[in-house]
């Protein structure tokens, strides 16, 4: 059956032979209605990429550099299955390219000019492409030929396989630049030895090199890693201090109609029957005909790449930047230490309009990018299409897990002029009911619930975390009879109460009328029994403060708070009747952009922040008539974080623990991708 067939692309006679053996052995173990293998032979991996894009083949396994080629238009392929190395319990699908230095040296990443460098080899990922790609725009012009520019940047190097006649400085630390183990400074261990011997000041290797060469922790402690933010970390902290994370070997397929489920079904069955130590007659991860045929011999198995993970996310911003710099050879005209405009990520149409107004008023210092969901915005910041946005704590957690950092906190209670330097404790997550109802925290089962959105702090993480510890399962849509929790599955009972309009029904953005704090409260007013919101929501939308037709006649005293002890209190008493304290919303950005984002935002709030008194005739950053567009409307200022500059420190141990516990109920495809 053609639709059940996976056409595997082979790039040599030996691969084609192994592919045919793979096909025949799979036929013998799979049912007739299961997936099957067909083999397509092409002259090169690039030809395979083109064949898959043209629907002449379905799958091929590629190194990271070729995954980049596969992702570029017009190919538009995506990673679907990753090879893993190491054990099944601790599978490694990536390695980290790092810059290692001796602890007693005193320079940072931005001070490498004039130092001596040790590389694994010319054109190799960790030893050349990544470090030189990331340093590309700091190299002296002309940058072509590249070897000459690198020779003029460092004061001496060892670059095995370089041309020592044309570029003698690249072989200064290893005469002749030998391209094999006869050169003592060749490859990973050699580059590290070059540093260890004192020949070089920095070695560009992979994270495991140090551990493989220095078994003793005391010896390893003599070395540090250079981080891209111009700090240093210990060699154990490679996950937080690396030049790039590099995928090892990956199966790619078409982004649309790519048969990824079938490919996974096939490879999963293949590893069960023919994986490491499974079968004598055919081995997936070795071959009598040659090395690394179809798959790497060192692979131990396959892992399915999460569906939300496209090639950009899989390769990572640093890796793509490095490779793009090398391939395209283009650098910004502005010096790299000058802040470029900050691209703000706006959620759907209404936020985009406010962002555009901000852009005009900022004289172009702010630019705008849009996405339909918060998770899509976070992904855009990760891959460099956008730079920053302000997020609820639940999304600060997801953004943090995806490598972004908090930059500034929204403050709601501290008056100027102390606001910018004050760390607030947070706001209260509350459960609001109508005063006329007889509901308590203990009899919510079967009631109608209203939530700001799935994954948000007050509207979801806190109430559902508390509920989970009571009911011990994740079927919240069965606990409540119906509700509106934007971001839920469209056919879920937690979308039943949402108002839409239609194509936007239950979408986690402002196009859904019941989205956010104000939306969840409106849901309670019009349809629901309980709303999970922040403690300021009721006062901000009653007593005529919200002029919208649905809200203009509402009275504060018609609503009460549910307390965890089963009692109820006035909305004026959140300090004595709340579900938990919630961390304030915060602005997040990529690490490399954090300083620029902070500087620009502090400058923007001086012009457009809460010191502006007349918002009818001036642009106001923190005002959108209860819609909380871009920032919460009750923001007084954006405040510096001082030492709370990681998502864990910012959110606090207790909240991180609560959200981590709730992860077993997670419906976040982005979180799944970021923790892959």
């Amino acid at each position: 059956v053609p639709e059940k067939s996976v056409r595997w692309c082979a790039v040599s006679e030996h691969e084609a032979t192994k592919c045919q053996s793979f096909r025949d052995h799979m036929k013998s173990v799979l049912p007739s209605n299961g997936p099957s293998v067909a083999c397509v032979k092409k002259a090169s991996h690039l030809d395979c990429i083109r064949a898959i894009a043209a629907n002449e083949a379905d799958a091929v396994t590629l190194d990271a550099g070729l995954v980049y080629d596969a992702y570029l238009a017009p190919n538009n392929l995506k990673p679907v299955v990753a090879e893993f190395y190491g054990s099944k319990e601790d599978p490694q699908t990536f390695y980290y390219a790092v810059a290692v230095v001796k602890k007693d040296s005193d320079f940072q990443m931005n001070q490498l000019r004039g130092r001596k460098s040790c590389h694994t080899g010319l054109g190799r990922s960790a030893g050349w492409n990544i470090p030189i790609g990331l340093l590309y725009c700091d190299l002296p012009e002309p940058r072509k030929p590249l070897e000459k520019a690198v020779a003029n940047f460092f004061s001496g190097s060892c670059v095995p396989c370089a041309d020592g006649t044309d570029f003698p400085q690249l072989c200064q630390l290893c005469p002749g630049c030998g391209c094999s183990t006869l050169n003592q400074y060749f490859s990973y261990s050699g580059a590290f030895k070059c540093l260890k011997d004192g020949a070089g000041d920095v070695a560009f290797v992979k994270h495991s090199t140090i551990f493989e060469n220095l078994a003793n922790k005391a010896d390893r402690d003599q070395y540090e890693l250079l981080c891209l933010d111009n700090t240093r970390k210990s060699v154990d902290e490679y996950k937080d201090c690396h030049l790039a994370r590099v995928p090892s070997h990956t199966v790619v397929a078409r982004s649309v109609g790519g048969k990824e489920d079938l490919i996974w079904e096939l490879l999963n069955q293949a590893q069960e029957h023919f994986g490491k130590d499974k079968s004598k007659e055919f081995q997936l991860f070795s071959s009598p005909h040659g090395k690394d045929l179809l798959f790497k011999d060192s692979a131990h198995g396959f892992l399915k790449v999460p569906p939300r993970m496209d090639a950009k996310m899989y390769l990572g911003y640093e890796y793509i930047t490095a490779i793009r710099n090398l391939r395209e050879g283009t650098c910004p005209e502005a010096p790299t230490d000058e802040c470029k405009p900050v691209k703000w990520c706006a959620l759907s149409h209404h936020e985009r309009l406010k962002c555009d107004e901000w852009s005009v008023n900022s004289a172009g210092k702010i630019e705008c990018e849009s996405a339909e969901t918060t998770e899509d915005c976070i992904a855009k910041i990760m891959n460099g299409e956008a730079d920053a946005m302000s997020l609820d704590g639940g999304f600060v957690y997801i953004a943090g897990m995806c490598g972004l950092v908090p930059v500034l906190a929204e403050n709601y209670n501290t008056p100027n002029p102390n606001c910018e330097n004050t760390a607030e404790e947070g706001y209260f997550a509350v459960a609001v009911v109508k005063s006329s109802s007889d509901l308590t925290w203990d009899n919510l089962k079967g009631k109608k619930s209203c939530h700001t959105a799935v994954g948000r702090t007050a509207g979801w993480n806190i109430p559902m975390g508390l509920l989970y510890s009571k009911i011990n399962h994740c079927r919240f849509d069965e606990f409540f009879s119906e509700g509106c929790a934007p971001g839920s599955e469209k056919n879920s009972s937690l979308c039943k109460l949402c108002m839409g309009p239609s194509p936007n029904l239950c979408e986690p953005n402002n196009k859904e009328g019941y989205y956010g704090y104000t939306g969840a409260f409106r849901c309670l007013v019009e349809k629901g029994d309980v709303a999970f919101v922040k403690h300021q929501t009721v006062p901000q939308n009653t007593g005529g403060k919200n002029p919208d037709a649905w809200a203009k006649n509402l009275k504060e005293e018609d609503y009460e708070l549910l307390c965890l002890d089963g009692s109820r209190k006035s909305v004026q008493e959140p300090a004595n009747c709340h579900l938990a304290r919630a961390p304030n919303h915060a602005v997040v950005a990529r690490k490399d952009k954090a300083d620029c984002v902070q500087t620009l935002l502090l400058d923007q709030q001086r012009m457009f922040g809460s010191s502006v008194t007349d918002c009818s005739s001036n642009f106001c950053l923190f005002e959108s008539k209860t819609k909380d567009l871009l920032f919460r409307d009750d923001t007084v200022c954006l405040a510096k974080l001082h030492d709370r500059n990681t998502y864990e420190k910012y959110l606090g141990e207790e909240y991180v623990k609560a959200v981590t516990n709730l992860r077993k109920c997670s419906t976040s495809p982005l979180l799944e991708a970021c923790t892959f």
Epitope: H349, E351, L353
Partner: nanobody, 117 residues
Framework: EVQLVESGGGLVQPGGSLRLSCAAS????????MAWYRQAPGKGLELVSG???????NYRDSVKGRFTISRDNSKNTLYLQMNSLRAEDTAVYYC???????????WGQGTLVTVSS
């Protein structure tokens, strides 16, 4: 109720010029930031240029040096002078004011600009 009426569009050859106008009523024109947007066939709405109440202006990169936005507060009118027009400028052009803070959907009917030889 805010009313925005755009005019001045038409068919023009590449390299040609057009001047769009937008008459606003019911808005607090003189104190609002105003902007021109455009929507090309099958594409999303994009900001072309904006002008604050004090007259400072901003342009998307692709129109810088070719388009000029201006306003006449006494006539409650916004203008967009478009020179050196290109085929990729073909779109329906809309003006908007940002005065309501609801980030409303007050859009006029737009004016079609077609650049073709």
């Amino acid at each position: 109720e805010v009313q925005l009426v755009e005019s001045g569009g038409g068919l023009v050859q590449p390299g040609g010029s057009l001047r769009l106008s937008c008459a606003a009523s019911g808005s607090i024109f003189s104190i609002a930031t105003m902007a021109w947007y455009r929507q090309a066939p099958g594409k999303g709405l994009e900001l072309v240029s904006g002008i604050t109440r004090s007259g400072s202006t901003n342009y998307r990169d692709s129109v810088k040096g070719r388009f000029t936005i201006s306003r006449d507060n006494s006539k409650n009118t916004l203008y967009l002078q478009m020179n050196s027009l290109r085929a990729e400028d073909t779109a329906v052009y809309y003006c908007t004011d940002y005065s309501s803070r609801y980030y409303h959907d007050y859009w006029g009917q737009g004016t079609l600009v077609t650049v073709s030889s």
